[in-house]
Amino acid sequence: KRFHDVLGNERPSAYMREHNQLNGWSSDENDWNEKLYPVWKRGDMRWKNSWKGGRVQAVLTSDSPALVGSNITFVVNLVFPRCQKEDANGNIVYEKNCRNEAGLSADPYVYNWTAWSEDSDGENGTGQSHHNVFPDGKPFPHHPGWRRWNFVYVFHTLGQYFQKLGRCSVRVSVNTANVTLGPQLMEVTVYRRHGRAYVPIAQVKDVYVVTDQIPVFVTMSQKNDRNSSDETFLKDLPITFDVLIHDPSHFLNYSTINYKWSFGDNTGLFVSINHTVNHTYVLNGTFSLNLTVKAAAPGPCPPPPPPPPRPPKPTPSLGPAGDNPLGLSEIPDENCQINRYGHFQATITIVEGILEVNIIQTTDVLMLVPGPDSSLIDFVVTCQGSIPTEVCTIISDPTCEITQNAVCSPVDVDEMCLLTVRRAFNGSGTYCVNLTLGDDTSLALTSTLISVPDRDPASSLRMANSGGGGLNDIFEAQKIEWHEHHHHHHHHH
């Protein structure tokens, strides 16, 4: 059998291999050692017994899409049946105190490979034997601790394969300089050690994409915006646009990246070298946002100019074109640059929102019959922008971290946007008060520290007001969860 018979549904063409030469990979026309690595078709009954205690699942992931020329990394993780794990020696053991369908196991080992390899079966002292080889006959590399690696992974794509000895997780990186653009298929077959041979335990495939467009994502955030994911934002407040470039192999690390913005509001083009930009829309409406990212990246060198035409000579010295699939344009020691572009487009809606909220006065409410430990305090609040429909207060400890009480209620406010919010405080002391005004699209927050005196008529209320920070909230049955807007990871240059 050949590798393509074992690993794929269809024999790939030489054309595919010639046009996608992967460094360090081999042609799948090579012979596969079926004695050492048996081949089972899908549905073969032997799969049922290929692993003690159930089936092993292989999970294949990649950091696709990959910009052509960059490296793409594939990771395979083996997921063992319940209660099984790989130990430090590479053996498969039962987890302590873990109960599966078979109950608790008396034998700690699912597979004790250390014991097998110590039974050195006529090796020649170098650790090399006829069975410490890959399916194509190449010997295992003898890294330190290689004997604890009991799985053989065979990766297959574009008519080529790559073999790797590993533990329950392996990683393979491939340079995409010579890979055809578009979606491609990676297939992986996994074998486990079985005495002096190997047994297939899992097969998995995944599509990856090679592109000549820089993969670009943009996060948009705005203070007081209630829902940052609905692409609806508020007028007269800056929106922060943050560009994230998907470049996991850092191919563009040494590239100068330019960001060209068109915000769709007739403010013209804005060019920047910063991945973050702020823009304020001053009109309501729907706007088309366009971003073009440009980077000078390492790329293929243009072919040299063709030689002057000459009459053909009947000479056998010219090999067929296919002998050199890289052609003249891939001279390896040349260091050429090529402009790469990425594009992002979004339609965003700009609406009125609550722009600002301020507590202008705090008053201790004198009660005719004062409660033993309770104080009522009125907060006089003003706002700018649209008219709020609800008010929420969160009363917490002085650090503003431990919530003691949270209340939301609808409000009916006039055009002046002046309202009084009354809240009860249990006992004297210093409290942090977060007060939020909200409508359908916006939330505006202000915070203040107040000191509630003992119920001694001589004492007075003290307040330290702090400005309106922008927190997003989620209302859920009178419970308010606060989370910061700005938690994104960036590709910095």
Partner: antibody, heavy 119, light 107 residues
Framework: QVQLVQSGAEVKKPGASVKVSCKAS????????MHWVRQAPGQGLEWMGE????????NYAQKFQGRVTMTVDKSTSTVYMELSSLRSEDTAVYYC????????????WGQGTLVTVSS | DIVMTQSPDSLAVSLGERATINCKTS??????LAWYQQKPGQPPKLLIY???KRYTGVPDRFSGSGSGTDFTLTISSLQAEDVAVYYC?????????FGGGTKVEIK
């Protein structure tokens, strides 16, 4: 939809050169190899070579090596095929054809350009 | 180079009858073989790729089969619009090569 539009018919004298163009639209130009296939009157199809618009790598059939040059203008999504030292047996319809990913079968063809070589 | 030998050179079949065209390659190209239909004054049109996969929009009376070095295009029930020249092409390796063509006519 994918379209390949070729330049018009040409009449050339023996020894001259001809440059045929093929303008692509309806797809990402740099993602697919472009091939040139010719057909002499009443004859079969003959593959001449291919070019990758992304990096301008080329592969030519041995028969045409040294006489054919394929080039690309990315700004106009156009591929060119220049054949030099023309002789009467080069009289043919020249087609550009787009391959599909890693597969060298041709779902999309230009309309063809007739090149007549005559003294 | 892979040599493609198509047979017969021409074929006359009654309407509604089966037409069979053969293509033999000088080496194993399986399954990298395509079939095209060409009518006068037009570029070729892809019918079958990878030996047996029908291209989008191609009527199901066209089918491809074969492996290794022997391949067949079958038109199960010939229609008037099927009168054309049919070519096989190996897409296994460079240089790509075509068969000499089979002219299909109505008897």
């Amino acid at each position: 939809q994918v379209q390949l539009v070729q330049s018009g018919a040409e009449v050339k004298k023996p020894g001259a050169s001809v440059k045929v163009s093929c303008k692509a639209s309806g797809y990402t130009f740099t993602s697919y190899w472009m091939h040139w296939v010719r057909q002499a009157p009443g004859q079969g199809l003959e593959w001449m070579g291919e070019i990758n618009p992304y990096d301008q790598r080329t592969n030519y059939a041995q028969k045409f090596q040294g006489r054919v040059t394929m080039t690309v203008d990315k700004s106009t999504s156009t591929v060119y095929m220049e054949l030099s030292s023309l002789r009467s047996e080069d009289t043919a319809v020249y087609y550009c054809a787009r391959s599909t990913g890693n597969y060298a079968w041709f779902a999309y063809w230009g309309q063809g350009t007739l090149v007549t070589v005559s003294s | 180079d892979i040599v493609m030998t198509q047979s017969p050179d021409s074929l006359a079949v009654s309407l509604g009858e089966r037409a069979t065209i053969n293509c033999k390659t000088s080496q194993d190209v399986s399954p990298s073989l395509a079939w095209y239909q060409q009518k006068p004054g037009q570029p070729p049109k892809l019918l079958i790729y990878s030996a047996s996969k029908r291209y989008t929009g191609v009527p199901d009376r066209f089918s491809g089969s074969g492996s290794g070095t022997d391949f067949t295009l079958t038109i199960s029930s010939l229609q008037a619009e099927d009168v054309a020249v049919y070519y096989c092409q190996q897409h296994y390796s460079i240089p790509l090569t075509f068969g000499g063509g089979t002219k299909v006519e109505i008897k």
